[in-house]
């Protein structure tokens, strides 16, 4: 449905002098009153005009009036200096009514034909104003047939008078500690008929300070105090103002955390208004003095409510509140002028007593028991039997509270057992089974399970043995009774070890030959290394050069001796390596199945027999001396041989350890 009044009936028509187009009579007076609908005006023009000309049109005339105003008095045919004829002019009513009066006097010197005029109602464009006139609307004017309406820009609302735009300037709340506020449109003239309210609301403890800046221009009166437009400032303590005129008001220190600013304007005037810059202050907190070995940040001239500072300690010092360490420290100034937390201390970092090093010791370098920042300690391993793995053992107490090595490691160094040490200098000469002396075979391990077997100690928590020797216990590792550090099989004086897990080579098939006859036992605890318990070395890549045909290896164990009984004392035998083809051929004939000797085996013994390992020796190490490192290494594991140990033309067969180095290393590193 269209807005505005009901569509009006058309208003238009014709007017003419009496008798037109003939001459008009004397002493005539005719009056027409034309009315247009509200919001419309009347337009009138003449198509014919012929009246007697007289000075100031005193005799005959047509008078056009709109309300009380005479629009024109017309006579003659053409305008003169003092008289006006309509010519082609168009006349408009000022409002919606137009009065037309025609008068003729008592005589005419000659005949005159009078006038003809046409009129019509047309819409008034109220939005069009003459220069110098006040605009119809404050902001936007919208004309329509029969009327107009005003609208306002965003942030304003149309006043009840339907023309003025009042500013929507109430309810603004300022909560920052400083800011600016001004009259609407500043520095352009402020709006009329507006009532603005601004609130500054800070946390309790703050005090607002108001400064009028730049310019101040609010409509005033010479005698009465701010009767038209005014600015008032209200706090919970007092009221300031009203303010008007052109003088900047003085600074106002409100001593309050809440301020309400009211600005009221009337319907007239053209003034630029005001601008306020506000700040705040509060009761300052005591100046923070940094603790020794610390500093304050940020550094300020003063600290007031909500201001904060942090304490940072110098490298090597840590924050302590009382006796408790702090990760960080920040204090905030409160409304009563006190800090919310007491000042902490910066205390020298203490790394604490260093951890004990298994199989090693620690020495305080800086001073006895000194464990504070930059203190130095020295770890070392127990001489002879342990060596430190890739580390110089020097640790420094660093700022993070950790003992740290020169390589930046925080973990302890590792004392690795020295391998391959023996009281024996060399084998060299071939001779029969001999009794071992203390320290000759410190890697020798006695394994008691279902049967008697042997093994060799690797590192300080692994035993290398033959798969067939521990196969029955692979799922019951704890059933293995592992003994070391003794020469006598039945002696009560030995070091006891227990198995945590048994790892049998996945290529070993029980009761189907002896290929891949190798196993590892993980001990549940590390053993202490000494002259009687020392691990055997694993072969280096270059070890094959010490294991050629006729090179001497040494086998040791408590297995069957020539007398057919298990040895009471650890025995050993020095035996040469046998050519692989020769050994393969020796086991080609019955009762041995073809292919008994594989590339994963090596053979050792005398062609004439008499020197061999035997039942009970299984799993023990066949060792060789690495003349370059002067360490003994395991080349073979006692695996199998002829039915009759030491038989002529037959040889002892050993698992070739060098083929299994990756397997051994993988198991040990994974577990």
């Amino acid at each position: 449905t269209p807005l505005g009044p009901k569509w009006p009936e058309p208003v238009f028509g014709r007017l003419a002098s009496p008798g037109f187009p003939g001459e008009y009579a004397n002493d005539q007076e005719r009056r027409w009153t034309l009315t247009a609908p509200p919001g419309y005006r009347l337009r009138l023009y003449f198509t014919h005009f012929d009246l007697e000309l007289s000075h100031l049109c005193e005799y005959d005339f047509v008078k056009l009036s709109s309300g009380a105003k005479v629009l024109a008095t017309l006579c003659g045919q053409e305008s003169t200096d003092t008289e006006r004829a309509p010519g082609k002019d168009t006349f408009y009513s000022l409002g919606s009514s137009l009065d037309i009066t025609f008068r003729s006097d008592y005589s005419n010197e000659k005949p005159f034909t009078g006038f003809e005029a046409f009129y019509a109602a047309e819409d008034i464009d109220e939005c069009q104003v003459a220069p110098g006139e006040a605009p119809t609307c404050d902001h936007h004017c919208h004309n329509h047939l029969g009327g107009f309406y005003c609208s306002c820009r965003a942030g304003y609302v149309l006043h009840r008078n339907k023309r003025t735009c009042s500013a929507l300037c109430s309810g603004q709340v300022f909560t920052q500690r400083s800011g600016e506020l001004s009259s609407p449109e500043y520095p352009r003239p402020y709006p009329k008929l507006s009532s603005c309210t601004y609130s500054i609301s800070l946390e309790e403890g703050f005090s607002v300070i108001l400064d009028f800046v730049e310019s101040f221009d609010v409509e005033t009166h010479p005698e009465t105090l701010c009767p038209y437009d005014f600015l008032k400032i209200q706090t919970d303590r007092e009221e300031h103002g009203p303010f008007c005129g052109k003088t900047l008001p003085h600074r106002i220190e409100t001593k309050s955390n809440t301020v309400t600013i009211t600005f009221v304007t009337d319907e007239s005037g053209d003034h630029t208004g005001w601008k306020i810059h506000y700040t705040s202050t509060a009761q300052p907190c005591p100046y923070p003095m940094a603790p020794p070995n610390g500093h304050v940040s940020p550094v300020q001239a003063k600290y007031i409510l909500k201001d904060s500072f942090s304490i940072f300690c110098e490298t090597g010092y840590e924050l302590l509140q009382g006796h408790l360490p702090l990760k960080s420290f920040t204090a905030v100034c409160q409304k009563d002028g006190s800090w919310d937390r007491p000042m902490p201390a910066c205390s020298i970092v203490d790394c604490g007593p260093p951890d004990d090093l298994p199989s090693g010791r620690v020495e305080y370098i800086t001073g006895p028991g000194v464990t504070t920042y930059k203190a130095v300690i020295q770890y070392s391993c127990e001489e002879t039997f342990y060596t430190m793995k890739v580390n110089d053992g020097k640790y420094v107490c660093e700022a993070d509270g950790f003992w740290t090595s020169s390589k930046g490691e925080k973990s302890l160094p590792v004392c690795e057992p020295v391998c391959g040490l023996s009281a024996r200098t060399t084998g060299g000469r071939i001779y029969g089974g001999q009794k071992a002396k203390p320290g000759d075979f410190p890697w020798q391990v006695l394994i008691l399970g279902g049967t008697t077997a042997a093994g060799a100690l690797l590192y300080d928590n692994w035993v290398l043995t033959a798969a067939h020797a521990v196969y029955e216990q692979k799922h019951d590792a704890s059933a293995l009774d592992i003994r070391m550090g003794t020469l006598k099989r039945l002696s009560p004086h030995y070091t006891q070890a227990w198995s945590e897990a048994v790892f049998i080579h996945e290529g070993y098939t029980h009761d189907a030959g002896f290929d891949n006859d190798i196993a590892l036992i993980k001990l549940n605890n590390k053993v202490v290394i000494n002259s009687n318990i020392t691990p055997i070395c694993l072969p280096r890549k270059e070890a094959e050069s010490f294991m050629r045909t006729d090179d001497i290896g040494t086998a040791s164990g408590w297995g069957l001796t020539q007398r057919g009984f298990l040895a009471r004392n650890l025995m050993y035998v020095d035996i040469p390596i046998v050519d692989h083809q020769k050994c393969t051929a020796a086991y080609e004939k019955p009762p041995y199945p073809r292919g008994s000797v594989t590339a994963n085996m090596l053979c050792a013994g005398l062609e004439s027999g008499g020197k061999d390992s035997c039942r009970g020796d299984a799993g023990g190490a066949l060792v060789f001396l690495d003349s370059e490192t002067e360490r003994w290494f395991v080349g073979g594991i006692v695996s199998w041989g002829s039915m009759n140990c030491g038989e002529a033309g037959q040889y002892g067969v050993y698992t070739k350890v060098i083929n299994y180095i990756p397997w051994i290393e993988n198991i040990i590193s994974d577990f």
Epitope: L320, Q321, G322, H323, L324, P325, L326, K327, S328, R341, S347, D350, G352, G401
Partner: antibody, heavy 118, light 107 residues
């Protein structure tokens, strides 16, 4: 060798006051940045800190129990005493004393079970 | 009293890594401490000041703390690590313990 040992009644009646004593050895209650804390653990529940006292005599209490707790130390006897007034069956718990060093509670007593029942 | 929230339980296979979280408002701004408690025993400090290990605590225990969460990590978990674990932090000068997490090492 650092040790702490709690002693006190095994059974307390409701409304009564509990007094627990912690006797320490292996460290000093008067020197160093050390403190002693009391912690309790109701059966089958989590640990609950109660109070602590440092060598400087600085004390602190659990907010919700502040009005009922008092901690003190007797340096000459190497003892820390905790009293807890107006005992209630919900206070039934194992009460531990423990040493504080560098913010960590690094040595604990074996604990004493206190039952509150009429 | 502020609240430190832990998952009630965590299960892990032997040799695998167990992670226990402890959540609290701005916990990363404070130091976190971790305790292990086995049934019938007193708690044992395993990590102090977020990531430091006391003497005698195995290297498989490690800690971290940032944002709102502290984490205790047990790498290569062993059967003997089955226990209740509690986090703890200091709020001003009062100690706050976590709700506790039961770590189960699967057979």
């Amino acid at each position: 060798q650092v040790t702490l040992k709690e002693s006190g009644p095994v059974l307390v009646k409701p409304t009564e006051t509990l007094t627990l004593t912690c006797t320490v050895s292996g460290f000093s209650l008067s020197r160093g940045k050390m403190g002693v804390s009391w912690i309790r653990q109701p059966p089958g529940k989590a640990l609950e800190w109660l109070a602590h006292i440092f060598s400087s005599d600085e004390k602190s209490y659990r907010t919700s129990l502040k009005s009922r707790l008092t901690i003190s130390k007797d340096t000459s006897k190497n003892q820390v005493v905790l009293t807890m007034t107006n005992m209630d069956p919900v206070d039934t718990a194992t009460y531990y004393c423990a040493r504080i060093r560098r913010g960590g509670i690094d040595y604990w007593g074996q604990g004493t079970l206190v039952t509150v029942s009429s | 009293q502020p609240v430190l929230t832990q998952p009630p339980s965590v299960s892990v296979s032997p040799g695998q890594t167990a992670s226990i979280t402890c959540s609290g408002d701005k916990l990363g701004d404070k130091f976190a401490y971790w305790y292990q408690q086995k049934p019938g025993h007193s708690p044992v400090l395993v990590i102090y000041q977020d990531n430091k290990r006391p003497s005698g605590i195995p290297g498989r225990f490690s800690g971290s703390n940032s944002g709102n969460t502290a984490t205790l990590t047990i790498s290569g978990t062993q059967a003997m690590d089955e226990a209740d674990y509690y986090c703890q932090a200091w709020d001003s000068s009062t100690a706050v313990f976590g709700t506790g997490t039961k770590v189960t090492v699967l057979a």
